[in-house]
Each structure stands twice: as C-alpha cells, then as structure tokens.
Interface confidence: low
C-alpha cells in the first residue's frame, strides 16, 4: 500500500511534469512563434486510454518525436531548450511509471498536433494529482 | 543530498582579479544550469546569468555583461565566477543557485562574500 | 524586462496572525513562471513556492501562493516564529530573471 510519504513525493513529480508540459505549451501557443503553424503539421499518437501511471509508458514513447518539434521553436525564453525538458521530463515519467512491469501501450486511431498532445497530457497530470489531494 | 559548496571570503583591492567558485554535489551536475545571484549590502536579490555545465552554455543578464564571466569546470563539477578588474561596487555577497529547466532556483549556495576596498 | 513591485516594504504582525504578501509585475507573467523565496538573516535564500501556487519540497501547508497576470500574493496563514524573514518574489519567464524588491515580515 502507498504510504503517506510515497504519495507526497508522486503528488510533486506529477506536479513537477505538469508545470515542464505547461510551459512548452506555453511556448509554442505564444503568439511570437513564427514556427507554431509548421509546428502544427506533425502528428503525435495519442494514448487509447491514460488514467494510471503506467500510461506514462505512451507519453515516454513519444518524447523523442516532442524534443525533433521544439528543436523548431528556437525560443527566446533560454530556459525552454529541448534537450533539458526532455531529458527532465523523462527522468519524472521513468520515476513515475516505475520499471516493475512492462506495459504495451495502446494508441488511438487518430493522431493529433503538438497542442492537442500537451493539453492531452497535461489533463492526465491535473487528474492524477486531484484523486491524490 | 543535493549540496552547493562556495568558496570562502574574500577581500581584495580595487583593479584586481578575482575567480570564486561552486561546486555541486548529489545531483547529476552536467544536467542542471547553475545560476549566480548577486545580494549587494542591504539590499535585494539580482540575477547575473546562468551556465549549463554538460556544454558551458553561458547566458548573462544584460546588467552584468562584459562585467563577469562565468565558467565551469564539469569533470571537478564546479562553476566559476570572475572578475578581470574590481571595482568597490562589486563588494557584495555573491550566491551561485541550481536552476531548474523552468527557471526557479531551487538549491543554493552558502555565499561568498566579496570586498573590495582600497 | 519585467520589473517586480513587492509590497508593503515591511510588515510588523505577531506570531499567529496572517500575513498577506503582493507582488505586482510591470507586464504579465505566466502564472507557470513565478516564484518566492524565503531569506533569513546571514542565509541563502530559500525555495518556497513555484509555479505561482506550487509549494517546494518540505514547505510546510501554512504557505501558499496565489495571483495570475500582473498581481502575485504569498500567504502564510499563520506566522510562527521561524516565519520572520524577507520575502522575495521572482519571475522566470523571461530573460533575464528579475526579482521583487522584498518584504520584510517582523516581529510587531
């Protein structure tokens, strides 16, 4: 069973991840970006169904593909440099999905753009972190 | 434990150099930036600029460019801070700060303080 | 860049009571890109809140954080003794970083 402890730290990395996919989305809908409607053209699966941590699994397989599209972006905010958030991101959902089991991920039949994939998951984050609080 | 080490005081005369130092430990200190925040007698907090230690990408704050450099040195994990030539207006205590990828300082330093007085 | 307004300059309350800390930005910050520190005398400063609302790691709940646009509050329900300090706010959504001016929380 989860101690208290446990689930304080899930709470934070889950709070953590949704403030890096919070602010990529923030930087590519600004509407400075020269690049957001190229960016719009590439198509990220979404996951069948993500309402446990082991989902995650389809968010860490898509990670690559997210880090090729912000290496467009090029923007001004010198905090939001791909390579970092990805990396960040990763270690947060490695840390959150665990290693124990090994889950096949399901995606739906329908891609979707950049933005769609980031409210996706940022909806994901919000809703894990209320049945916690 | 995530840990940032300054280097000691330091009192110096006007026109010289001076290199302090920061050094990291209990992370993995190639994968964060480290920030330098300067605190003048009295006062309040100021942001100088950041470096990525995996790379030294360096970004300065446009107040304290030219002003100082920053470096660092990833095999020893340490990043550096230096002056060619002080001045009395950089008597100050001096914080070197982890920089999250969003932008917050969540680990500091000690400080050092410098003085700098003919 | 953004120029951070924190005020009052100093606050005298009493342990016990509430204090309710502003910081106002010359432009809007994301909520997502705003941050507040904790310094006590001769100390580092310290982590407190991101992401406007988000307490950092072993802050106690008495803190919390509020505002989105221009206007940022910092709220410690209850100030305990160790709660006497300056405050500053920081935003970090764009270069450079800036931070507020202070607030000075004393003992009344």
């Known amino acids: 069973a989860p101690t208290s402890s446990s689930t304080k730290k899930t709470q934070l990395q889950l709070e953590h991840l949704l403030l890096d996919l919070q602010m990529i989305l923030n930087g590519i809908n600004n509407y400075k970006n020269p690049k957001l409607t190229r960016m719009l053209t590439f198509k990220f699966y979404m996951p069948k169904k993500a309402t446990e941590l082991k989902h995650l699994q389809c968010l860490e397989e898509e990670l690559k593909p997210l880090e090729e599209v912000l290496n467009l972006a090029q923007s001004k905010n010198f905090h939001l440099r791909p390579r970092d958030l990805i990396s960040n991101i990763n270690v947060i959902v490695l840390e959150l999905k665990g290693s124990e089991t090994t889950f096949m991920c399901e995606y739906a039949d329908e891609t979707a753009t950049i933005v769609e994939f980031l409210n996706r998951w940022i909806t994901f984050c919000q809703s894990i972190i209320s049945t916690l609080t | 434990e995530v840990q940032l080490v300054q280097s000691g005081a330091e009192v110096k005369k006007p026109g010289e150099s001076l290199k302090i130092s920061c050094k990291g430990s209990?992370?993995?200190?190639?994968?964060?930036?480290i920030g330098w925040v300067r605190q003048m007698p009295g006062k309040g907090l100021e942001w100088m600029g950041i470096i990525y230690p995996g790379d030294s990408d360096t970004r300065y704050s446009p107040s304290f460019q030219g002003q100082v450099t920053i470096s660092a040195d990833k095999s020893i994990s340490t990043a550096y801070l230096q002056w060619s030539s002080l001045k009395a207006s950089d008597t100050a205590m001096y914080y070197c700060?982890?920089?999250?990828?969003?932008?917050?300082?969540?680990?500091w330093g000690q400080g050092t303080t410098v003085t700098v007085s003919s | 860049e953004i120029v951070l307004t924190q005020s009052p300059g100093t606050l005298s309350l009493s342990p016990g009571e509430r204090a309710t800390l502003s910081c106002r930005a010359s432009q809007s910050v994301s909520s997502s890109y705003l941050a507040w520190y904790q310094q006590k005398p001769g100390q580092a400063p310290r982590l407190l809140i991101y992401?406007?609302?988000s307490r950092a790691t072993g802050i106690p709940d008495r803190f919390s954080g509020s505002g989105s646009g221009t206007d940022f509050t910092l709220t410690i329900s209850r100030l305990e003794p160790e709660d006497f300090a300056v405050y500053y706010c920081q935003q970090y959504g764009s270069s450079p970083l800036t931070f507020g001016g202070g607030t000075k929380v004393e003992i009344k």
């Open positions: 700060a982890r920089q999250q990828v969003a932008g917050m300082l969540d680990y």
């Open positions: 992401g406007a609302s």
């Open positions: 209990g992370y993995s200190f190639t994968s964060y930036w």
